[in-house]
Interface confidence: medium
């Protein structure tokens, strides 16, 4: 699983006038990490784990980066020509990733009023625009402005993503939190299903990093994919993750089934409670 930093910025316009504030959230490795507090004009860490990653700092650097990005996006919104009356939003999602083999990937997506109209793969410099005429018009508007702006400021999209990767590396290098290994807590529960059947659920929680194998086995052999239901691997808000897997079995055969868990090179099996 690659390490990733994901910026989600939104700016608003009302009756063609771009509003001064902006909304921003940053996710690190899929976890809510920072958000921009509009009232306080500050980037704020999301929870204790984010504070641990950032260390004993005032988050001025993060505040500066986010406000700069917010201003850029506000300027971009000001150049969109179809600003009709009412409320409109421009959203930019920027993601950079560092993979295990040290390769990197970066992408950028723009949404107007919640609708995707422009994407870019930064490595290939390939832009993708949906087929709709509205998306094509918006994309042309924004791309022209971004091109002009890049020439004026002598910067390029690469510079923005180099910054993203630099920040991500900085967090990875400086933080023991992101290099840690937290084994999951595994809990197996049972509930009555239809007559003669029971549903057994295996839950893994509070683990890090995100990669995990969780599967049901019968007599030591993994059940087929289609006989099991999996939950997504989701952040639990504490910098760790949670997931689950469930299957339906015949009552009385519980002792034949075990939940198998593998995480960070460690594995364990967990029986169905009687």
């Amino acid at each position: 699983e690659p390490h990733s930093l994901r910026y989600n910025l939104t700016v608003l316009s009302w009756d063609g006038s771009v509003q001064s504030g902006f909304l921003a959230e940053v996710h690190l490795d899929g976890q809510p990490f920072l958000r921009y507090d509009r009232q306080k004009c500050r980037a704020k860490p999301q929870g204790q784990w984010a504070e641990d990653v950032l260390g004993n700092k005032t988050w001025d650097r993060e505040t500066r980066d986010l406000t700069g990005n917010g201003k850029d996006l506000r300027m971009t919104l000001a150049h969109i020509k179809d600003q009709k009356e009412g409320l409109h939003s421009l959203q930019e999602i920027r993601v950079c990733e560092i993979h295990e083999d040290n390769s990197t990937r970066s992408s950028q997506h723009f949404y107007y009023d919640g609708e995707l109209f422009l994407s870019q793969n930064v490595e290939t410099e390939e832009w993708t625009v949906p087929q709709s005429s509205r998306a094509q018009t918006l994309a042309m508007n924004v791309r022209n402005f971004l091109k002009e702006d890049a020439m004026k400021t002598k910067t390029h999209y690469h510079a923005m993503h180099a910054d993203c990767l630099q920040e991500l590396r900085r967090y990875l290098e400086s933080s023991v939190v992101l290099r840690r290994r937290v084994p999951p807590m595994v809990n197996v529960t049972r509930s009555e299903a239809s007559e003669g059947n029971i549903t057994v659920t295996c839950r893994a929680s509070s683990f890090y990093p995100r990669n995990i194998t969780l599967t049901w086995r019968q007599d030591g052999v993994s059940l087929s994919h289609d006989t099991q239901q999996w939950g997504d691997v989701l952040p639990d808000g504490n910098g760790t993750y949670q997931t689950w897997v469930a299957t339906r079995i015949c009552q009385g055969e519980e002792q034949r089934f075990t939940c198998y868990m593998e995480h960070s090179g460690n594995h364990s099996t967990h029986p169905v409670p009687s």
Partner: antibody, heavy 118, light 107 residues
Framework: QITLKESGPGILKPSQTLSLTCSFS??????????VGWIRQPSGKGLEWLAH???????YYNPSLKSQLTISKDTSRNQVFLRITSVDTADTATYYC??????????WGQGTTLTVSS | DIVMTQSPATLSVTPGDRVSLSCRAS??????LHWYQQKSHESPRLLIK???QSISGIPSRFSGSGSGSDFTLSINSVEPEDVGVYYC?????????FGGGTKLEIK
């Protein structure tokens, strides 16, 4: 109509503790996004921001004075307080409280003057 | 801390003049820059927010411009009641800091 009014002791001796009160009306510190801060101005000099308190009780202090400052609020009475310990002659100034919502101080009190003298 | 530097320290003008007051931040603060006016024996009053946005009740002769680290407050046609000290404020990075002020005088 939004108003803020500062009150304080007027005169203190060095090493004493300064207690200031900001009484305001026309807005509530229970409203999301609302904040009140303290700014001081020595006579004939510029403005220095000291401390700020937000609706959610989040507090910000000027790092250069943090060890001396304590800000607090009484939301129900529409009051904000600032305590400065161990005052010195350098703390002689006019102290203002001001409302800050979207990043700027939009309403200010008339100020209260403090003289520190032995 | 971000240091805000204002120039000139004092400005003597004739009524009707167009004047420009400068404010420079020691690092980029985007457009998180606010201007205040302080008349003698009064408390400061907000003039311009976010570098260039006007404030309700403030005469239209006051305008602001700039972004990043260089900012300007312009007074289109100075009136005698504009005398006072003008301060810029960094509203971007903590701690919030003010410039040293520019004193506007009438000749």
């Amino acid at each position: 109509q939004i108003t803020l009014k500062e009150s304080g002791p007027g005169i203190l001796k060095p090493s004493q503790t300064l207690s200031l009160t900001c009484s305001f009306s026309g807005f509530s510190l229970s409203t999301s996004g609302m904040g009140v801060g303290w700014i001081r101005q020595p006579s004939g000099k510029g403005l220095e921001w000291l401390a700020h308190i937000w609706w959610d009780d989040d507090k910000y202090y000027n790092p250069s004075l943090k060890s001396q400052l304590t800000i607090s609020k009484d939301t129900s009475r529409n009051q904000v307080f600032l305590r400065i310990t161990s005052v010195d002659t350098a703390d002689t100034a006019t102290y203002y409280c001001a409302r800050r919502t979207q990043g700027y101080f939009d309403y200010w009190g008339q100020g209260t003057t403090l003289t520190v003298s032995s | 801390d971000i240091v805000m530097t204002q120039s000139p320290a004092t400005l003597s003008v004739t009524p009707g003049d167009r004047v420009s007051l400068s404010c420079r931040a020691s690092q980029s603060i985007s457009d998180y820059l606010h201007w205040y006016q302080q008349k003698s024996h009064e408390s400061p009053r907000l003039l311009i927010k976010y570098a260039s946005q006007s404030i309700s009740g403030i005469p239209s002769r006051f305008s602001g411009s700039g972004s990043g680290s260089d900012f300007t407050l312009s007074i289109n046609s100075v009136e005698p009641e504009d005398v006072g000290v003008y301060y810029c404020q960094n509203g971007h990075s903590f701690p919030w800091t003010f410039g040293g002020g520019t004193k506007l005088e009438i000749k």
